[in-house]
């Protein structure tokens, strides 16, 4: 038998905010005319399901967000590569659970400067996951999350705020001064931290 890695490598899910994309690389003997077909299934199911729109494709990614949309379920996907010469190789992912494996993007935040304070409003982060009634769930609906906010005052001093609410305000700031704010989503039960959202804002001049 030939080594499947010659045609196909690194089959894995890349998941951000519950958008689940299957990606892979061609092996050293893969060519631009190698075609790829994708199947997926849930834990313990016998039959693999062919993903429509990802059969005999030449690109090296396939969006499986809809097919892997139950965030309590375990999924697998597998890719079969077929070269122009008729050689084939199949590889599968490890078990994938979006609740556990998705990475969190930076939150969407509005930073509002005032004279002696900076207000930060965190907006709910939508996901592709839908509730029973069809509406899209936010990260807050899915996780017991909190927000961690930091304001860099100078090189040696930072102010910190945190909690589950969406509105925060750093008080006691100097007017007409630039500050760097960093806001992250934290999910302690899953040991997750989002990439940070950063805003550089200047407090308003004191006109009094």
């Amino acid at each position: 038998p030939e080594d499947p890695s010659d045609l196909l490598q690194h089959v894995k899910f890349q998941s951000n905010n519950f958008e689940n994309i299957l990606t892979w690389d061609s092996g050293p003997e893969g060519t631009p005319d190698t075609v790829y077909s994708i199947e997926y299934k849930t834990y313990g199911e016998r039959d693999w399901v062919a993903k429509k729109g990802c059969q005999r494709i030449t690109r090296k990614s396939c969006n499986l967000t809809v097919e892997t949309g139950n965030h309590t379920e375990l999924y697998y996907a597998r890719v079969t590569a077929v070269s122009a010469g008729g050689r084939s190789a199949t590889k599968m992912t490890d078990r994938f659970n979006s609740l556990q494996h998705t990475a969190l993007k930076p939150p969407d935040v509005t930073c509002i400067p005032k004279v002696r304070s900076i207000q930060m409003i965190v907006h709910p982060t939508p996901t592709p996951i839908r509730a029973g009634d069809g509406h899209r769930l936010t990260l807050e609906d899915i996780y017991d999350l909190s927000y961690h906010l930091e304001l860099q005052v100078n090189r040696t001093y930072q102010m910190h705020l945190g909690g589950k609410q969406r509105e925060y305000e750093f008080f006691g700031l100097t007017p007409d001064t630039e500050f760097l704010g960093t806001i992250m989503i934290c999910v302690p039960t899953w040991s997750k931290k989002s990439a940070p959202y950063m805003c550089r804002v200047r407090t308003l001049p004191d006109r009094t």
């Epitope: 309590t72 992912t93 490890d94």
Partner: antibody
Amino acid sequence: EVQLVESGGGLVQPGGSLRLSCAASGYSITAEYMNWVRQAPGKGLEWIGEINPSTGTTTYNQKFKGRFTISVDQSKNTAYLQMNSLRAEDTAVYYCARFDAYFDYWGQGTLVTVSS
Amino acid sequence: DIVMTQSPDSLAVSLGERATINCKSSQSLLYSSNQKNTLAWYQQKPGQPPKLLIYWASSRESGVPDRFSGSGSGTDFTLTISSLQAEDVAVYYCQQYYSYPFTFGQGTKVEIK
């Protein structure tokens, strides 16, 4: 037709090592999970662990972790069970079995006897 | 670890009669994602490897005669052979795949009376 064939069993002294092989045919070993299960003479079945042959990711029964190692050679379409520090109580028929939850195809098994 | 306990340890049934094997798990095997039970049944004849009969507690494996059926939910499960045939003489095992490590019952030996 899917077939699994184990080999490498035999008599080994206590404290010794053995490597069992499981040659898969009729499908690509990287297309499904592979497990090792053992059965002591006249006893029940005991799950040792599993491997995703595509990624090499393994999960073990804690009872065997550290002494037993599961691996795969994709180019040979073969899975392996490396067994170290063998004891008399490891005497059993060792099976490889396919799938990720329950086991749809089994090899015929290979007998390992640990005795001085 | 989830402990699987089968009863009886052995069973003698007349040809054509019903054989019932029970399997009890130390915790629920109901998988919340699909509301199915993560339990399989195997048949093992002397000198042979186990053969998959039933998965998801009640789904019959392809090629398995329909006299074999599985039922139950949660922690209590049953394998029924509706009309015992001579070729059904074997040891039967249940197995849970709810969590690691996967575990088996101790086996039930079915003989002809």
